[in-house]
């Protein structure tokens, strides 16, 4: 049961963000998940290293990962999915999932590649009037749903308020997605829903929208967030653009 | 030197609670299980549950359960059982020890306190 | 998951070669240990993974098997190896050792 031979998924991700790493087999069998070891392999000669372990109900995160990663798959379901919180630089790499099924001695294997991005700007500049886009992206090797997107703002006047809205109802397979309150008209979604983007594009931007803007995916019970703190500067002075504008004329004496 | 130090010898009422420590010395007490086994000449060595300091999980032997609840500190890197109800088949020695992570669902004790 | 573990005493000389095996009730997929108890102390790791040599022991300590067939074999028995056997299966909870083989000096 050996996936590692085909070539395995590829992550990209930056520091501080999350990653979830697919670890899902088919069975033919109703038989369920016994233990489940992750490993990384950092490769450049470097030792491997410890992850997580799991077995008889008990979820061990390893040294270095503890309190950063956990299992989200469900267990009883056949998913050893493992997702990895405040991802760093050292945690470049593949990650190798090895699933075992009790009376079984065969080991069912699946390679992730982890690649790690320096860390985004979680500060953007932005002019009055100007347009502006805040990215939210998890990644995830998972095609899971996303349940809902909500961006939140809190601005200057402690009060939170809703910027933007997605739903999507599984059962009814009903979108919906929203833009509220003095963000109405003004935000839009550019991120592929499919693809677990969630960002949006603020335009018109105003002076009261320097903030805090916390994103959050909900991707069934799991949930990523993400805080932005967007500046907003004055408007830029719009000076009309002539030739006599872009050259300075030194005038005589005679001269109006 | 890795070394897990065990409370002394201690004598108690039939019904009694006791509580017995072990502690952790030259290694990072929240990456490794803490196992608790109980030797008798009749039974020998009998595998009373794990707890994991890191994550707080425990496991318990089913023939245990009620009998040994397993606590640790980790402020002071130091496991505890405390066994109740106690009575004479519960007089024997006790032992802590250290279960390594060896890869690949492999586990095995490589540190034990005295006992 | 019980483990049966013979013989339950035996007397060898030095230089002699010992072999203790150990019956597991099911297959444990090589998830199997040795340890050596010496009188009035706690067990010591001489075997884990059914095979491997844990660091320190003597390469005298050899270890075999799989499914549910293992066992312990000292190439030459010295003085110091006079002591009490344990194998322990580690592939499922509850943990169970054997009863134990006390090995004693001819």
């Known amino acids: 049961l050996n996936d590692l031979n085909v070539s395995p998924p590829e992550l990209t991700v930056h520091v501080g963000d999350s990653a979830l790493m697919g670890c899902v087999f088919q069975s033919t069998e109703d038989k369920c998940i016994f233990k489940i070891d992750w490993t990384l392999s950092p490769g450049e000669h470097a030792k491997d290293e410890y992850v997580l372990y799991y077995y008889s109900n008990l979820s061990v995160p390893i040294g270095r990962f503890q309190n950063r990663v956990h299992l989200m798959g469900d267990i009883l379901c056949n998913d050893g999915s493992l997702l990895l919180q405040d991802v760093q630089e050292a945690d470049q790499g593949t990650y190798i999932c090895e699933i075992r099924l009790k009376g079984e001695s065969q080991v069912f294997k699946k390679a992730v590649v982890l690649h790690v991005l320096p860390e985004e700007p979680k500060e953007l500049m932005v002019h009055v009037g100007g347009l502006i886009q805040m990215g939210c992206v998890f990644q995830s090797t998972e095609v899971k749903h996303v349940t809902k997107v909500e961006w939140i703002f809190s601005g200057r006047r402690a009060k939170e308020e809703i910027v933007f809205r997605y739903y999507h109802k599984l059962r009814m397979s009903v979108e919906y997605s929203q833009s509220w309150g003095h963000f109405q008209n003004r935000v839009n979604l550019v991120g592929d829903i499919f693809r677990n983007d969630g960002s949006i594009m603020l335009q018109g931007v105003r002076e009261s929208d320097g903030g805090n803007y916390t994103c959050s995916i909900h991707l069934g019970n799991l949930v990523f967030k993400k805080t932005i703190v967007l500046h907003v500067s004055p408007e830029e002075p719009r000076t009309l653009v002539t030739p006599a504008a872009l050259r300075p004329l030194v005038l005589g004496g005679n001269q109006l | 030197d890795v070394q897990l130090v065990e409370s002394g010898a201690e004598l108690v009422r039939p019904g009694a609670s006791v509580k017995l420590s072990c502690k952790a010395l030259?290694?990072?007490?929240?990456?490794?299980?803490m196992h608790w086994v109980k030797q008798t000449p009749v039974h020998g060595l009998e595998w009373i549950g794990i707890?994991?300091?890191?994550?707080?999980?425990?496991v318990y032997n089913q023939k245990f359960k009620g009998k040994a609840t397993l606590t640790a500190d980790k402020s002071s890197s130091t496991a505890y059982m405390e066994l109740s109800s106690l009575t004479s088949e519960d007089s024997t020695v006790y032992y802590c020890?250290?279960?390594?992570?060896?890869?690949?669902?492999?586990?095995?004790?490589?540190?034990w306190g005295a006992g | 998951m019980v483990l049966t573990q013979s013989p339950a005493s035996l007397a060898a000389s030095v230089g002699e070669t010992v072999t203790i095996t150990c019956r597991a009730s099911?297959?444990?997929?090589?998830?199997l240990a040795w340890y050596q108890q010496k009188q009035g102390k706690s067990p010591q790791l001489l075997i884990y993974?059914?095979?491997s040599l844990e660091d320190g022991v003597p390469s005298r300590f050899s270890g075999s098997g799989s499914g549910t067939q293992y066992s312990l074999k000292i190439n030459s028995m010295q003085p110091e190896d006079t002591a009490t056997y344990f194998c322990?299966?580690?592939?499922?909870?509850?943990?169970?050792f054997g009863a134990g083989t006390k090995l004693e000096l001819d």
């Open positions: 020890t250290r279960r390594r992570y060896y890869g690949s669902s492999y586990w095995y004790f490589d540190v």
């Open positions: 030259a290694y990072t007490f929240t990456d490794y299980e």
């Open positions: 707890i994991h300091p890191g994550s707080g999980g425990t």
């Open positions: 099911e297959n444990i997929y090589y998830s």
């Open positions: 993974n059914a095979n």
């Open positions: 322990e299966q580690t592939y499922d909870v509850p943990l169970t």
